[in-house]
Interface confidence: low
């Protein structure tokens, strides 16, 4: 018989229904059955412990005392439910130089103070903006690109017409306010949009108005990265500006996150009929 | 240049409260960062006791928590330190210092320190 | 609290030597470690930070390494003004710890 329920591990939980649990009380659910917020299952004679976390997509990363990253603490605490051991939440942000990042899967607010979660100024980025955690300010940043959406003309609540549910959504995100889809098709007096740069754009929510401008001036002062940053940017371009501490990422295509790590699963598509949206 | 100096009485009766404060220039308290106070022992041990971060919030060590606060006068741009029911075992040369930036706790900017005697 | 202990306590070199200063950290702190430079009378200064870059302004010949829970500080061609203390710091968890102190003196 297995001593613990970690001996019967698969992919997407525990089953150990191979074994008699008449024999071994093991396999009843009861509040030990599960650690690290499994959820226990019992179907028939299978009991199975299931990690099937509802994370939210908010990008808040932390690094993990296994040294990884992960897109949130939520994440972090999936993964050690699937793992079936601890993991602590040892800083903000990515690990600097971590294995690879938990799926998505993110500081220690450690042994001082557990009832006080740190405030933090990124709570006012909106709109699918991410935090860069490392600004001396707040500065969010919107990672969002539009250039593999196909051509599909929307009108927007903002009165102007887009190519795509993307650049709606990049909108939103670079003007810090809500946008929505008002109507399939290009709105009736025409006005369309003009679209950003390939890279994620880097403004002060209380700048938006300024965004264009503080992103060109930002882009003439980038610099390539020191050679201690190899890997800082997993799938991108690692860029340094003077007039930022740490160096910024310009994620490929179909990539997001601080450090590029994450898989743009973000993009909208518009489903026929009521307006409504899917996110794939 | 950011500069941090630290001020206040370097004699201190026991079981009296500690009080002293860190004027910053060259950067706004408010701006960024987390400002901490540190301490080191006459045997050179250096211990952390505390941050005010740049919106306010704190974090204590455990073991002072009970004794400690750190609070901050934005419209002076500094930040002080008051730690209550002192012992000799507080004798130490005091530092305040800045946080290197956000997630990354290592510490660029120290003031030159005071030296708090606490005897009766 | 996550404990730091720092090896050797103190140690004799010449101009131009290597030097190499190791910190053990009591449980994984990652790459949460930074280290400081402290003359006599004078507030500890930033050398490293996230175990391995050199802060703004740091000669070359200071380089740290390491993950986990092992770290060291080289210094790879020791110059008149290292002579002082050299203390590791952890900021893995709260509180955030520093080792004991390595005094580097004058052979």
């Known amino acids: 018989f297995p001593t613990s329920l970690s001996d019967c591990q698969t992919p997407t939980g525990w089953n150990c229904s191979g074994y008699d649990d008449r024999e071994n009380d093991l396999f009843l659910c009861d509040t030990n059955t599960c650690k690290f917020d499994g959820e226990c299952l019992r179907i028939g004679d299978t009991v199975t412990c299931v990690c099937q976390f509802k994370c939210n997509n908010d990008y808040v990363p932390v690094c993990g005392s296994n040294g990884e990253s992960y897109q949130n603490e939520c994440y972090l605490r999936q993964a050690a439910c699937k793992q079936q051991s601890e993991i602590l939440v040892v800083s903000e942000g990515s690990c600097a130089t971590d294995a690879g990042s938990g799926s998505g899967d993110g500081v220690h607010e450690g042994s001082g103070e557990t009832s006080q979660k740190e405030t933090s100024t990124c709570d006012i980025c909106q709109f699918g903006a991410e935090c860069d955690e490392d600004a001396e300010d707040v500065w969010c940043v919107c990672n969002i690109d539009c250039s593999q959406t196909n051509f599909n003309p929307l009108c927007a609540s903002d009165g102007k017409s887009y190519d795509n549910a993307c650049q709606i959504k990049e909108a939103s995100c670079q003007k810090q306010e809500k946008i929505e889809v008002m109507s399939l098709g290009r709105c009736q007096d025409n006005t369309t949009t003009t679209t950003k740069s390939e890279d994620g754009h880097y403004a002060r929510t209380d700048y938006a108005e300024n965004a264009n401008k503080l992103e060109e001036s930002a882009r003439e002062h980038h610099i390539p990265c020191p050679e201690h940053y190899n890997g800082f940017c997993m799938h991108g371009k690692c860029e340094h500006s003077i007039n930022m501490q740490e160096p910024s990422c310009r994620c490929d295509a179909g990539y997001t996150g601080q450090h590029c790590e994450k898989k743009d699963y973000s993009v909208l598509y518009v489903v026929p009929g009521p307006v409504r949206f899917q996110y794939v | 240049d950011v500069q941090l100096q630290e001020s206040g009485p370097g004699l201190v009766k026991p079981s009296e409260t500690l009080s002293l404060t860190c004027a910053v220039s060259?950067?706004?308290?408010?701006?960024?960062?987390?400002w901490s106070w540190i301490r080191q022992f006459p045997g050179k041990k250096l211990e952390w006791m505390g941050f005010?971060?740049?919106?306010?919030?704190?974090k204590y060590n455990p073991s002072l928590k009970n004794r400690i606060t750190i609070s901050r006068d934005t419209s002076k741009n500094q930040f002080s330190l008051k730690l209550s029911s002192v012992t000799a075992a507080d004798t130490a040369t005091y530092y305040c210092?800045?946080?290197?930036?956000?997630?990354?706790?290592?510490?660029?900017?120290w003031g030159q320190g005071t030296l708090v005697t606490v005897s009766s | 609290d996550i404990q730091m202990t720092q090896s050797p306590s103190s140690l004799s070199a010449s101009v131009g030597d290597r030097v190499t200063i190791t910190c053990k950290a009591s449980q994984n702190v990652v790459t949460a470690v930074a280290w400081y430079r402290q003359k006599p009378g004078k507030s500890p200064k930033l050398l490293i930070y996230?175990?391995?870059n050199r802060h703004t302004g740091v000669p070359s010949r200071f380089s740290g390494s390491g993950s986990g829970t092992d770290f060291t500080l080289t210094i790879s061609s020791l110059q008149p003004e290292d002579f002082a203390d050299y203390f590791c710091?952890?900021?893995?968890?709260?509180?955030?710890?520093f080792g004991g102190g390595t005094k580097v003196e004058i052979k």
């Open positions: 710091q952890q900021y893995s968890s709260y509180p955030f710890t």
């Open positions: 060259g950067y706004s308290i408010t701006s960024g960062y987390y």
């Open positions: 005010i971060s740049y919106d306010g919030s704190n």
């Open positions: 210092a800045r946080g290197l930036r956000r997630g990354d706790y290592s510490m660029d900017y």
């Open positions: 996230s175990a391995s």
